[in-house]
C-alpha cells in the first residue's frame, strides 16, 4: 500500500543559495558537515541527473549501514528535488521504497521553508512504523541544520555565481561558487 | 485545457474480459499519476487503481486486486484499465482522474473524465 | 482502510442559506490530507478542496473547508441555484484512497 505524508520546517538561508549546498552539493557537504549523520556518499551510477544511483553509507552505532537513492528529478528553476530510496536502510521486508520531494521555497526575510513530501511503498497491507517517519525526519533536520551552521559560518560558500564549464561538469552546467570548486567532483 | 476521455465500456457477461482506455491531452501527462474511479448506479465513488507517471507502480482497491490491471503509454497519451473476471457488482460508471500534484502524486483527483459505463449481465 | 462518514445524507436548503456538511474519519488524517467534491447528476466530480481548506483552481470563495480533529466540514456561504448537488468528501494519507457515502444537498 502506500503513506502518505509531509513535513515543512524553515531555514534563514535563502532558497537560491540553500538548494545549491543543501541539494546540489550535498554528496560533497553532508560526510563534511554531519560526519555523525553521513561517512560517505558515493555515485554508484549517472551524472546527478534523473537515473542516478547514489550510496548513502551512515558511520558505525547508527541502525542501518546504508541506503541507495535515485534521483528522479532535479528542478533547479524551482528548487525541487524529487528522489526515491530503493535500497538498504529502512527498505526490506515490509518497504519497498520511499519516494521524496523537497522543495525550498524563498520567504519574504529572506530565508526559506523546505516543504518535504514522502510517499511510504509498503508491501502488502503493513503499516509505516511511526518510528521510521520520524527517524526519517530527524535525520533530514540534523543534515539541514549542519549545512545551514556551514553556510552562515561560510559566508561566501555557495553564493557567488560562477559557470562551470559542461565539459568540468560532465555535460550538465549549474551556477556554483568559487569556494565549490574546491569541493567539487564529478557526478 | 486539460480533457480526459474513456473509452470501451459496454454490456459484458460475468467472467468475461474488458479493457477501458483512457486518453488524455492539455497537460504534460509523462508527469502525473492516473487513477480509476468507479459509480455503481445510484451509489457512491469507489476508488479503483493508481498508475505512477512513469508505469513502475501499480496500486488496487482490494475488490478488483488480482482482477484488475492498470497500464499506460506515455508516448500514445493513454491509460488502460484491463477487468478480467467480471462480476455483477462491477456495473458501474469509470472515470479516470488526473492525480492534482505532478511526479509522485498526492492521490487526490484534480481533473476526471466524462466516464464510461460497463454493465455487467447475464 | 480509513472509512469517511458524512452527514447529514440529505441537506434541504433554500438558495442564499449556508450549507454545513460534515465528513468524520475513522482514524487521524495526517497533514489535513482531505479532499471534497461537488457531483451533479450524470455529471463527472469536481474537485472544491484539497489539503482540507486549500480551494482548487476556479472554485468560487463561498466554498470552504475547515477541520477539528478527525472531523472535516465544508460550508458553503451562500447556496446559489447551481450549487445542488451530492458532495462527497475522500482521504488521500493512506491507501485505499476511500470515500465518504455523499451528502445530497437539495432544494428545501
Known amino acids: 500500500g502506500v503513506f502518505n505524508y509531509e513535513t515543512e520546517t524553515t531555514s534563514v538561508i535563502p532558497a537560491a543559495r540553500l538548494f545549491k549546498a543543501f541539494i546540489l552539493d550535498g554528496d560533497n557537504l553532508f560526510p563534511k558537515v554531519a560526519p555523525q549523520a553521513i561517512s560517505s556518499v558515493e555515485n554508484i551510477e549517472g551524472n546527478g541527473g534523473p537515473g542516478t544511483i547514489k550510496k548513502i553509507s551512515f558511520p558505525e552505532g547508527l541502525p542501518f549501514k546504508y541506503v541507495k537513492d535515485r534521483v528522479d528529478e532535479v528542478d533547479h528553476t524551482n528548487f525541487k528535488y524529487n528522489y526515491a530510496v530503493i535500497e538498504g536502510g529502512p527498505i526490506g521486508d515490509t518497504l519497498e521504497k520511499i519516494s521524496n520531494e523537497i522543495k525550498i521555497v524563498a520567504t519574504p526575510d529572506g530565508g526559506s521553508i523546505l516543504k518535504i513530501s514522502n510517499k511510504y511503498h509498503t508491501k502488502g497491507d503493513h503499516e509505516v512504523k511511526a518510528e521510521q517517519v520520524k527517524a526519517s525526519k530527524e535525520m533530514g533536520e540534523t543534515l539541514l541544520r549542519a549545512v545551514e551552521s556551514y553556510l552562515l559560518a561560510h559566508s561566501d560558500a555557495y553564493n557567488e555565481q560562477k559557470l562551470i564549464s559542461e565539459e568540468d561538469l560532465g555535460g550538465e552546467q549549474k551556477l556554483i561558487s568559487e569556494e565549490d570548486l574546491h569541493h567539487h567532483h564529478h557526478h | 485545457q486539460v480533457q480526459l476521455v474513456e473509452s470501451g465500456g459496454g454490456v459484458v457477461q460475468p467472467g468475461r474480459s474488458l479493457r477501458l482506455s483512457c486518453a488524455a491531452s492539455?497537460?504534460?501527462?509523462?508527469?502525473?499519476?492516473i487513477h480509476w474511479v468507479r459509480q455503481a448506479p445510484g451509489k457512491g465513488l469507489e476508488w479503483v487503481a493508481v498508475i505512477s507517471y512513469d508505469g513502475d507502480d501499480k496500486y488496487y482497491g482490494d475488490s478488483v486486486k488480482g482482477r484488475f490491471t492498470i497500464s499506460r503509454d506515455n508516448s500514445k497519451t493513454m491509460v488502460y484499465l484491463h477487468m478480467n473476471s467480471l462480476r455483477t457488482e462491477d456495473t458501474a460508471v469509470y472515470y479516470c482522474a488526473k492525480d492534482g500534484y505532478s511526479l509522485y502524486g498526492k492521490d487526490y483527483f484534480d481533473y476526471w473524465g466524462q466516464g464510461t459505463l460497463v454493465t455487467v449481465s447475464s | 482502510e480509513i472509512v469517511l462518514t458524512q452527514s447529514p445524507g440529505t441537506l434541504p436548503l433554500s438558495p442564499g442559506e449556508r450549507a454545513t456538511l460534515s465528513c468524520r474519519a475513522s482514524?487521524?488524517?495526517?497533514?489535513?490530507?482531505l479532499a471534497w467534491y461537488q457531483q451533479k447528476p450524470d455529471q463527472a466530480p469536481r474537485l472544491l478542496i484539497y489539503g482540507a481548506s486549500s480551494r482548487a483552481t476556479g472554485i468560487p470563495d463561498r466554498f470552504s473547508g475547515s477541520e477539528s480533529g478527525t472531523d472535516f466540514t465544508l460550508t458553503i456561504s451562500r447556496l446559489e441555484p447551481e450549487d445542488f448537488a451530492v458532495y462527497y468528501c475522500?482521504?488521500?494519507?493512506?491507501?485505499?484512497?476511500?470515500f465518504g457515502q455523499g451528502t445530497k444537498v437539495e432544494i428545501k
Open positions: 482514524q487521524s488524517i495526517t497533514n489535513s490530507y
Open positions: 492539455g497537460f504534460t501527462f509523462s508527469r502525473y499519476a
Open positions: 475522500q482521504q488521500y494519507v493512506r491507501s485505499p484512497w476511500t
